[in-house]
């Protein structure tokens, strides 16, 4: 069958029909429905929402909708023994205690089952000691403390401000520095935008607001007790001592009212420079310990949370493809929230719901996509991407053979300024072409394309007249598909004009104040940005599932490979003497990139010219495109990170949210001047260049003519 015969409608009309069916009012209605009560992973509330979504997706017209459950390690506060932090005097009396809960927002005073702020997976403990302020607790912050300021964190409780990097990296850094506890807080410098009121009068964080979140260092493992395999009924579970990624010291988050009380008494060293000062009226002294009058006072943490194996539920919907049912395009986003989930995740889940409804409407009119579309409502994303990872582990053999693309659908908005896209280079042209066809929702860009407003507001740093598209990092459900399985992936959302705080999130992130009203009153009253994101995500899925030739351009991978090779070479060239001494050469990598570029160019020429009416040749060419991303996977994974297997991209070892290019080489070079055995260290650099060069060459060869 030809594609048109299978789908009954001309391709152009299909896409227009799909996009025209998406309605802002429906997204608004779905968001309201999804945000009236909390949907914490492992609770009946979230299970009921899973069943509701299952039922509605069936009504919308999907061929099948199933629940997939797993029994994974989650973490919860003790209901009768709350977590808090004290200042204690020399007699051990608690003279100040942090708050036990966030003051509920207006209209939500009577809602039960709001989980109090906690750091998920913190071990239990009641450490007490002197405080050290460690800025953002980044790698460079600890370098500054330990190497420049000669401040020892061993045996201290550290207090770090949220922002810049994933909180799990902060905790890992504190552990490595010898800290015995970590206090995380939101500083107004990072979570209070000037000129905006705090919630409920604006979108800023009030002093009693607190960011929840997990503090794991899973490195892609999924359930900490069953790394590599699904947490099913017959799973063999590791003991808690062997679990992957659990922190070893107590951790607890607080708001800036409570942080003020801790930080105002700090003594010891002054902050090293202005980048260590936030916006509180405190000196931002580093410590250790409190100043003169208060020097006998200590800080004590009281953490009683427990880790429990708990059942979670994914919803998996299928719309069977008419021509290539064994090729899967996946649209997935999570359902579980810390509290109401007004932005994270329900602004994304509402968009997925409307996309499913639109596809279902077309299906009821007799249309089917060329390829199968899978829709997923993931559980337990907030606890370490657990639902998506367990499902992918269970279905890895199918996915690695049949997975065409994965489009992520968490929060649709983190601002209302412009589009933000992170994706594989294979999707650059798809995103460019699609956004040129969509209307911009931005004020001042009426009648203009989304591409135009996006390019104007967020220009590419390398190519004029093009928008910025970022590397995929992690911290969301695409991780297992892209970093472990090598399935081409992408994500899109509306963002803020706040490049400096790229990884801090929006002010009310993971707090009780992330409500429907936050979105409806302050971020997107007309739901026009949500609609645009639905069009981008849905449009990408539509094209990926329905294009006769997959909308991947391998030449764009060639361009970025050259850019990444240049970048890593220049990092290495900061050590010219050692490169000479240890005979470090990047020739093999540059040669492989050159070969990739030439082969990709020839492949693209053949792609223009081949007989698309020959289903065997069409399938062969599409398979070469589909499997290109897979070709960048190293089955052995990255050093000490076996589930990060993509050689070109991995989450940064210093910030899970950020993507790093040629991560194997990058990590081998990182802080190499401090390594005790330079010969061994530079040997590892050479090995990583070899792995990268081989992988790029091998990937190039998958695009060569098959015989």
């Amino acid at each position: 069958k030809s594609s048109n015969e299978a789908t009954n409608i001309t391709p152009k009309h299909n896409m227009k029909a799909f996009l025209d069916e998406l309605k802002a009012e429906n997204i608004k209605k779905f968001l309201y429905n999804f945000t009236q009560i909390p949907h914490l992973a492992g609770t009946e509330q979230n299970f009921q929402l899973a069943k509701q979504i299952q039922s509605q997706w069936k009504e919308f017209g999907l061929d099948s909708v199933e629940l997939a459950h797993y029994d994974v390690l989650l973490s919860y506060p003790n209901k009768t023994h709350p977590n808090y932090i004290s200042i204690i005097n020399e007699d051990g009396n608690e003279i100040f205690n942090t708050s036990l809960f966030e003051p509920p927002p207006p209209g939500y005073e009577n809602v039960s089952d709001i989980v109090p702020p906690f750091s998920a997976f913190s071990p239990q403990g009641m450490p007490e000691g002197d405080l050290v302020y460690v800025n953002y607790a980044r790698t460079e912050d600890f370098f500054k403390l330990e190497r420049d300021m000669k401040i020892n964190c061993s045996g201290k409780i550290v207090i770090a401000r949220y922002g810049k990097v994933f909180r799990g990296n902060k905790v890992k850094n504190a552990q490595l520095a010898g800290a015995k506890g970590v206090i995380l807080y939101s500083d107004p410098a990072d979570y209070f935008a000037p000129g905006v009121k705090s919630y409920p009068d604006g979108w800023n964080l009030p002093g009693g607001g607190v960011q929840r979140g997990n503090i794991l260092n899973l490195n892609g493992a999924g359930d900490p007790l069953t790394p590599g395999y699904p947490a099913n009924e017959y799973a063999y579970r590791r003991g808690i001592a062997e679990a992957v990624g659990l922190p070893s010291i107590p951790v607890h988050p607080i708001g800036y009212y409570d942080a003020q009380k801790l930080l105002e008494k700090m003594g010891g060293s002054a902050p090293p420079d202005s980048s260590w000062r936030g916006s509180l009226k405190v000196p931002y002294n580093v410590g250790p310990g409190f100043t003169g009058n208060f020097s006998t006072q200590k800080v004590k943490m009281h953490i009683h949370s427990t880790n429990e194996v708990t059942r979670i539920y994914n919803v998996i919907g299928t719309l069977r493809g008419a021509v290539e049912p064994d090729r899967y395009v996946i649209l997935g986003g999570h359902r579980d929230s810390w509290v109401f989930g007004g932005i994270d995740p329900q602004s994304g889940a509402a968009v997925v719901h409307e996309i499913v409804r639109s596809f279902g409407t077309l299906k009821k009119e007799g249309w089917r996509p060329r390829r199968t579309i899978l829709f997923a409502s993931w559980d337990a994303e907030e606890f370490g991407l657990l639902g998506s990872t367990e499902w992918a582990e269970e279905n890895s053999r199918l996915l690695q053979e049949r997975g065409v693309a994965y489009i992520n659908a968490d929060s649709s908005i983190e601002g209302n300024y412009t589009l933000r896209v992170d994706c594989t280079p294979l999707m650059y042209s798809l995103v460019h072409n699609l956004t040129k066809e969509l209307k911009s929702p931005d004020e001042g860009f009426e009648g203009k394309s989304l591409y135009e407003s996006w390019t104007k507001k967020s220009p590419s740093p390398e190519f004029s007249g093009m928008p910025r598209i970022s590397k995929l990092g992690s911290g969301n459900d695409f991780e297992v598909f892209f970093q472990r399985l090598g399935i081409a992936s992408g994500r899109a959302r509306y963002t803020k004009n706040w490049e400096t705080n790229k990884f801090s999130g929006y002010p009310l992130y993971h707090s009780v104040y992330e409500t429907y009203e936050l979105v409806e009153k302050f971020y997107d009253p007309m739901f026009k940005y949500h609609l645009t994101v639905a069009q981008v995500r849905g449009g990408m899925v539509f094209e990926l599932a329905n294009s006769i030739v997959l909308p991947f351009d391998c030449r764009d991978y060639a361009v970025v490979l050259r850019k990444y090779a240049d970048k890593i070479y220049s990092i290495s060239m900061k050590h010219p003497q050692e490169m000479k001494t240890y005979s470090v050469s990047f020739d093999s990598l540059f040669s492989a990139v050159k070969n990739f570029t030439e082969i990709a160019s020839k492949f693209s020429e053949r792609l223009q010219d081949f007989d698309k009416s020959n289903p065997i040749v069409l399938r062969m060419m599409n398979d070469q495109l589909m499997f290109l991303e897979r070709a960048f996977i190293d089955p052995l994974g990255l050093p000490d990170r076996p589930f990060y297997r993509h050689v070109i991209y991995a989450p940064s070892s210093h910030n899970k949210y950020a993507g790093e290019s040629f991560p194997g080489i990058y990590d081998a070079l990182f802080d190499i001047e401090s390594k005790v055995d330079p010969s061994k260290a530079w040997g590892e650099v050479k090995r990583q260049i070899y792995v990268a060069a081989f992988t790029v060459q091998a990937a190039a060869e998958t695009l060569s003519e098959v015989a």
Partner: antibody
């Protein structure tokens, strides 16, 4: 259709033990727990305890701790409540009820039909 | 233990009447309260969970609400099949406790 079917009525002598069963069907047994509640003649309802078969955890009302044992057989989707050292004031209708296995739940949604236990010398 | 004080213990009403039953909690239970119906034969059915959410299949004449520590079950228009005993149940903290019951009889 969710169903909880309890075993038949029992007559026991003081000091004896009774074991009441509750067979579940129409849902995934290990996704839920079973609570046990009793009602003495003409009286109100009293919660005795609950068991979560997936993880084997049991929680008891202090009033019954040491006298009651809750168990579950996952292979047959059946929960059991054994009450020992029976007294005349244990004469009651004993109910099982389904409860979601999770950190927060909405307590008992479906109930068994009840089992009458009479303790009489 | 949390005490649940239910009132009235019994009431007589006619078909079509509006009926309200109240439970007062001795401690804060948030919205962790259910309403149960027990028919004369002994069968128990949950009507409302989490203070105000209606179970599937339960007629919309039943509703639940809260004011402070007082929780109310309302039957907007009593039907013949509604004559039964009604209990509140708090599940905020263990041991879970029930109100004493309200028997709704035909006037």
């Amino acid at each position: 259709e969710v169903q909880l079917v309890q075993s038949g009525a029992e007559v026991k002598k003081p000091g004896a033990s009774v074991k009441v069963s509750c067979k579940a069907s129409g849902y995934t047994f290990t996704s839920y727990g079973i609570s046990w509640v009793r009602q003495a003649p003409g009286q109100g309802l009293e919660w005795m305890g609950e068991i979560f078969p997936r993880r084997g955890n049991t929680y008891y009302n202090e009033k019954f701790r040491g006298r009651v044992t809750l168990t579950a057989d996952k292979s047959t989707s059946t929960a059991y409540m054994e009450l020992r050292s029976l007294r005349s004031d244990d004469t009651a209708v004993y109910y099982c009820a389904r409860v979601f296995d999770g950190y927060y739940n909405y307590a008992m949604d479906y109930w068994g039909q009840g089992t009458t236990v009479t303790v009489s010398s | 233990d949390i005490q649940m004080t239910q009132s009235p213990s019994s009431l007589s009403a006619s078909v079509g009447d509006r009926v309200t039953i109240t439970c007062r909690a001795s401690q804060d239970i948030g919205s962790s309260l259910n309403w149960l119906q027990q028919k004369p034969g002994g069968a128990i059915k949950r009507l409302i969970y989490a203070t105000s959410s209606l179970d599937s299949g339960v007629p919309s004449r039943f509703s639940g609400s809260r004011s402070g520590s007082d929780y109310t079950l309302t039957i907007s228009s009593l039907q013949p099949e509604d004559f039964a005993t009604y209990y509140c149940l708090q599940y905020a903290s263990s041991p879970y406790t029930f109100g004493g019951g309200t028997k709704v009889e035909i006037k």
